[in-house]
Amino acid sequence: CKAMHVAQPAVVLASSRGIASFVCEYASPGKATEVRVTVLRQADSQVTEVCAATYMMGNELTFLDDSICTGTSSGNQVNLTIQGLRAMDTGLYICKVELMYPPPYYLGIGNGTQIYVIDPEPCPDSDF
């Protein structure tokens, strides 16, 4: 396994609709055709997998239909969007990139993006 540098923003604020987007960029040293991107969430020293997608260079990322993630790829950049976030989902979201095929296998893990999610204030009842 060979190491690879992965860069991602330090902080992102989710929108009022619970959507957060960030770019995950990797310094590809090889000529991979198949790339796997995984988003991990770290909170309270627990790491869980949020979503993952394997894609062919030059093609679109395809997450599973029930995934909370969507994304697009362009060169060595992956634009990730996570939706359906609530305040309790605030945490460090780590981008992991693997150059799967052909050999050599490269693995890169970003430092993480701290996503802050603030639940919107409920609208007060109106008498109108």
Partner: antibody, heavy 125, light 107 residues
Framework: EVQLVESGGGLVQPGGSLRLSCAAS????????MHWVRQAPGKGLEWVSY????????YYADSVKGRFTISRDNSKNTLYLQMNSLRAEDTAVYYC??????????????????WGQGTLVTVSS | DIQMTQSPSSLSASVGDRVTITCQAS??????LNWYQQKPGKAPKLLIY???NLETGVPSRFSGSGSGTDFTFTISSLQPEDIATYYC?????????FGQGTKVEIK
């Protein structure tokens, strides 16, 4: 027993089409990268195409790009090669091959460790 | 594309002889090289992977070495059943390419 069995070869006229199949058994088909390799009569081996385990990633040799399509049906444990616009120079024995991937914490090992018996494709008028 | 140049294209040796085949890549492929044996009318068989690792079940008289662009395949003591054509293959850049093959015969 781990096995690959090709079928679908035969005689076809130039410009015609043919679909080769490769039936896999004895292993978890969807976990493996698969390839097609061909060998013209009396010649050496030529790599043709590959497909990832999920089918999401493919690649072709320049000599067949735009004419051949590799695909797989993991529910049927079968690999396919759709060959269109066939030329005389496509005449060969076509082999499907499994690219095994041994994964451990240190290394990932590749190599075509299982091959089919081959199916002959003859393109001639 | 990476070109793989194998030599010799054919050789004749006696039973018990040491046989050496070389394979040269047109650019650095690290150790991502495999060696295959193909007997007449049969499918190829993987003998050596990653330049020097013996595939399970392959006799220890077969060995491989090298890294970068220059690789060597050796049969330490040629046996009658080793009559075949041997191919090297690079496995790190698409399209994967094979050497042109070395036909080994018994004198």
């Amino acid at each position: 027993e781990v096995q690959l069995v090709e079928s679908g070869g035969g005689l076809v006229q130039p410009g015609g089409s043919l679909r080769l199949s490769c039936a896999a058994s004895g292993f978890t088909f969807s976990s493996y990268y698969m390839h097609w390799v061909r060998q013209a009569p009396g010649k050496g081996l030529e790599w043709v195409s590959y497909i990832s385990g999920s089918g999401s990633s493919t690649y072709y040799a320049d000599s067949v790009k735009g004419r051949f399509t590799i695909s797989r049906d993991n529910s049927k444990n079968t690999l396919y090669l759709q060959m269109n616009s066939l030329r005389a120079e496509d005449t060969a024995v076509y082999y499907c091959a499994r690219d095994r991937m041994l994964v451990d914490s240190v290394n990932r090992v590749f190599g075509f460790d299982v091959w089919g018996q081959g199916t002959l494709v003859t393109v001639s008028s | 594309d990476i070109q793989m140049t194998q030599s010799p294209s054919s050789l004749s040796a006696s039973v018990g002889d040491r046989v050496t085949i070389t394979c040269q890549a047109s650019q650095d492929i690290s150790n991502y090289l495999n060696w295959y044996q193909q007997k007449p009318g049969k499918a190829p068989k993987l003998l050596i992977y990653d330049a020097s690792n013996l595939e399970t079940g392959v006799p220890s008289r077969f060995s491989g070495s090298g890294s970068g662009t220059d690789f060597t395949f050796t049969i330490s003591s040629l046996q009658p059943e080793d009559i075949a054509t041997y191919y090297c293959q690079q496995h790190t850049n698409f399209p994967f390419t094979f050497g042109q093959g070395t036909k080994v015969e018994i004198k």
